[in-house]
């Protein structure tokens, strides 16, 4: 039997201060550029080394950004989301969904990812 992949989903509020080169990450997604099937949400595709997000340390590649400064990112065109981030000001509050993959093996067996095997 194969192990089952589950996800632990958590949300976090992350406050970033815009750095010399902006917020320091890349985004994908939107109603016209779906990154995840049947989900037009906005996702973090890259964290820039030594950028604002990397120095803060909490935002991760693959995170879904739910809102920016309280403004919901649902059902936005990709460019509209980009513009929202770029115009968000110096202090930026992000509501973020982290999705941590958890490997569960069949009952009575260790999962494939268990290093103790």
């Amino acid at each position: 039997m194969n192990g089952r992949v589950d996800y632990l989903v958590t949300e976090e509020e992350i406050n970033l201060t815009r750095g010399p080169s902006g917020l320091g990450f890349n985004i994908v997604g939107g109603t016209d550029q779906q990154y995840v099937s049947n989900d037009s949400g906005i996702y973090v595709s890259r964290i820039k080394e030594n950028g604002a997000a990397a120095l803060d340390g909490r935002l991760q590649e693959g995170d879904k950004i739910l809102s920016v400064n309280g403004q919901d990112l649902k059902n936005l065109l990709h460019q509209d989301a980009v513009d929202l981030f770029r115009n968000a000001g110096y202090a930026v509050s992000l509501r973020v969904q982290h999705r941590l993959q958890v490997q569960n093996g069949p009952i009575g067996h260790r999962g494939e990812g268990d290093p103790s095997g």
């Epitope: 080169s21 902006g22 990450f25 890349n26 994908v28 890259r46 604002a52 980009v82």
Partner: nanobody, 125 residues
Framework: EVQLVESGGGLVQAGDSLRLSCAAS????????MAWFRQAPGKERDFVAT????????NYADSVKGRFTISRDNAKNTVTLQMNSLQPEDTAVYYC???????????????????WGQGTQVTVS
């Protein structure tokens, strides 16, 4: 495996045109910001042009504005650089580069890009 393969370089005379192409594989191309950089002998790698995921937004180095045009074809996973009115100072190795998503921190620094081609030589005499 991600691959960016440039083609179209060569030796031309001042005032001539060249069209460089970059074929991408191993990535979901439509999610990627793509760019061209160039590096002359003994110099740093310089930004030339960038294009967003859909092709609707482009940005150029001042030195090539009005002469070079970047475009992309998401159906064919290619990005092209049309270079007109070439000058001897355009002589360099030209590199195609890509990064997933749209940057919120700038797109003119080589460090903003994750994937690179091997380069194609352009010489203008």
């Amino acid at each position: 495996e991600v691959q960016l393969v440039e083609s179209g370089g060569g030796l031309v005379q001042a005032g001539d045109s060249l069209r460089l192409s970059c074929a991408a594989s191993g990535i979901t191309f439509r999610w990627y910001t793509m760019a061209w950089f160039r590096q002359a002998p003994g110099k740093e790698r310089d930004f030339v042009a960038t294009i967003n995921w859909s092709g609707s937004d482009t940005n150029y180095a001042d030195s090539v504005k009005g002469r070079f045009t970047i475009s992309r074809d998401n159906a064919k996973n290619t990005v092209t650089l049309q270079m007109n009115s070439l000058q001897p100072e355009d002589t360099a190795v030209y590199y195609c580069a890509g990064v997933p998503g749209t940057s919120l921190s700038g797109e003119t620094d080589p460090r903003d890009y994750d994937y690179w081609g091997q380069g194609t030589q352009v010489t203008v005499s």
